[in-house]
């Protein structure tokens, strides 16, 4: 599932490049392992912002698929309460390219620990 999430992120990156979306997004670029589920939640919520701002059907479908995949991969630990983690709004705002790069990085963390 996580490998499919990465290919969806690459697809979103390709689709966005032709659209010139200027949004800045809350981005966790240095994820601590004990906060990775919280960070994933922030990435997914921000991904929905991309979908809404783009108004693009392909981006919408890909984002929705990515959320479904991530949900199923995290169904066992998605409700784990991680303490001492940053709220989404406390994170640095970065451009879409940097956001997606950091997103791939956190997904790789999940791959390495699964």
């Amino acid at each position: 599932n996580w490998v499919n999430v990465i290919s969806d992120l690459k697809k979103i990156e390709d689709l966005i490049q032709s659209m010139h979306i200027d949004a800045t997004l809350y981005t966790e670029s240095d994820v601590h392992p004990s906060c990775k589920v919280t960070a994933m939640k922030c990435f997914l919520l921000e991904l929905q912002v991309i979908s809404l701002e783009s108004g693009d059907a392909s981006i919408h479908d890909t984002v929705e698929n990515l959320i479904i995949l991530a949900n199923n991969s995290l169904s066992s630990n998605g409700n784990v309460t991680e303490s001492g983690c940053k709220e989404c709004e406390e994170l640095e705002e970065k451009n879409i390219k940097e956001f997606l790069q950091s997103f791939v990085h956190i997904v790789q963390m999940f791959i390495n620990t699964s």
């Epitope: 589920v37 994933m40 939640k41 997914l44 919520l45 929905q48 979908s51 809404l52 059907a57 392909s58 919408h60 479908d61 890909t62 984002v63 929705e64 698929n65 959320i67 479904i68 991530a70 949900n71 199923n72 995290l74 169904s75 998605g78 409700n79």
Partner: antibody, heavy 122, light 112 residues
Framework: EVRLMASGGGLVKPGGSLKLSCAAS????????MSWVRQTPEKRLEWVAT????????YYPDSVKGRFTISRDNAKNTLYLQMSSLRSEDTALYYC???????????????WGQGTSVTVSS | DVLMTQTPLSLPVSLGDQASISCRSS???????????LEWYLQKPGQSPKLLIY???NRFSGVPDRFSGSGSGTDFTLKISRVEAEDLGLYYC?????????FGGGTKLEIK
């Protein structure tokens, strides 16, 4: 008023195939993900398949995966369910349903068609 | 898979009474983004199912306010404050937080 008309049901032998259709009208079909849900003779409901708005992504439970294929033709406003290797337990009334977007709404099936009956028996 | 258990199987009521249907999931159906995709559907005799409630407590358009949904995590309830004749039928809960999406077994609301 949203309209969904399912058709294509019938009697088929175990191991046989059948293709169901669902004609959509009175809404912009390509703006919605769509699903198939079936109801057994005992009145239990079972989710069968979901397809994304553009048709690139499909989802199935294990009970039908590899045997059923959901597809759509947005130009024809039509949803399909190709069923193969049919079993007696696939006997049910099959409904098509429109899905509200997870991102902009509640991810619910807000409108359902009237259903088409599939009987698998020798 | 998430198992959805509905109780009771059958609920005999008098018109005007309050009715309460319970739905319990085998695991929490709060998704990673914090949403709980739990719906209630009503199937009247001879008809297709119709959406009543989505995301636990949101009433679908045109649904009377005598219907209300509540709950969180694994325990959910549908309440009908004053049962009318048109409310009779089969009620189903449904989770679509996690694939495979699953329905409860159904509750038949009938006249006592």
């Amino acid at each position: 008023e949203v309209r969904l008309m399912a058709s294509g049901g019938g009697l088929v032998k175990p191991g046989g195939s059948l293709k169901l259709s669902c004609a959509a009208s009175e809404f912009t079909f390509s703006n919605y993900a769509m699903s198939w849900v079936r109801q057994t003779p005992e009145k239990r409901l079972e989710w069968v398949a979901t397809i994304s708005r553009g048709g690139d992504y499909t989802y199935y439970p294990d009970s039908v995966k590899g045997r059923f294929t959901i597809s759509r033709d947005n130009a024809k406003n039509t949803l399909y369910l190709q069923m193969s290797s049919l079993r007696s337990e696939d006997t049910a009334l099959y409904y098509c349903a429109r899905r509200v977007s997870m991102i902009t709404g509640g991810w619910a099936m807000d409108y359902w068609g009237q259903g088409t009956s599939v009987t698998v028996s020798s | 898979d998430v198992l959805m258990t509905q109780t009771p199987l059958s609920l005999p009521v008098s018109l005007g009474d309050q009715a309460s249907i319970s739905c319990r999931s085998s695991q929490s159906i709060v998704d990673i983004t914090g949403n709980t995709y739990l719906e209630w559907y009503l199937q009247k005799p001879g008809q297709s199912p119709k959406l009543l409630i989505y995301k636990v407590f949101n009433r679908f358009s045109g649904v009377p306010d005598r219907f209300s949904g509540s709950g969180s995590g694994t325990d959910f309830t549908l309440k009908i404050s004053r049962v009318e004749a048109e409310d009779l039928g089969l009620y189903y809960c449904f989770q679509d937080s996690f694939v495979p999406y699953t329905f409860g077994g159904g509750t038949k609301l009938e006249i006592k």
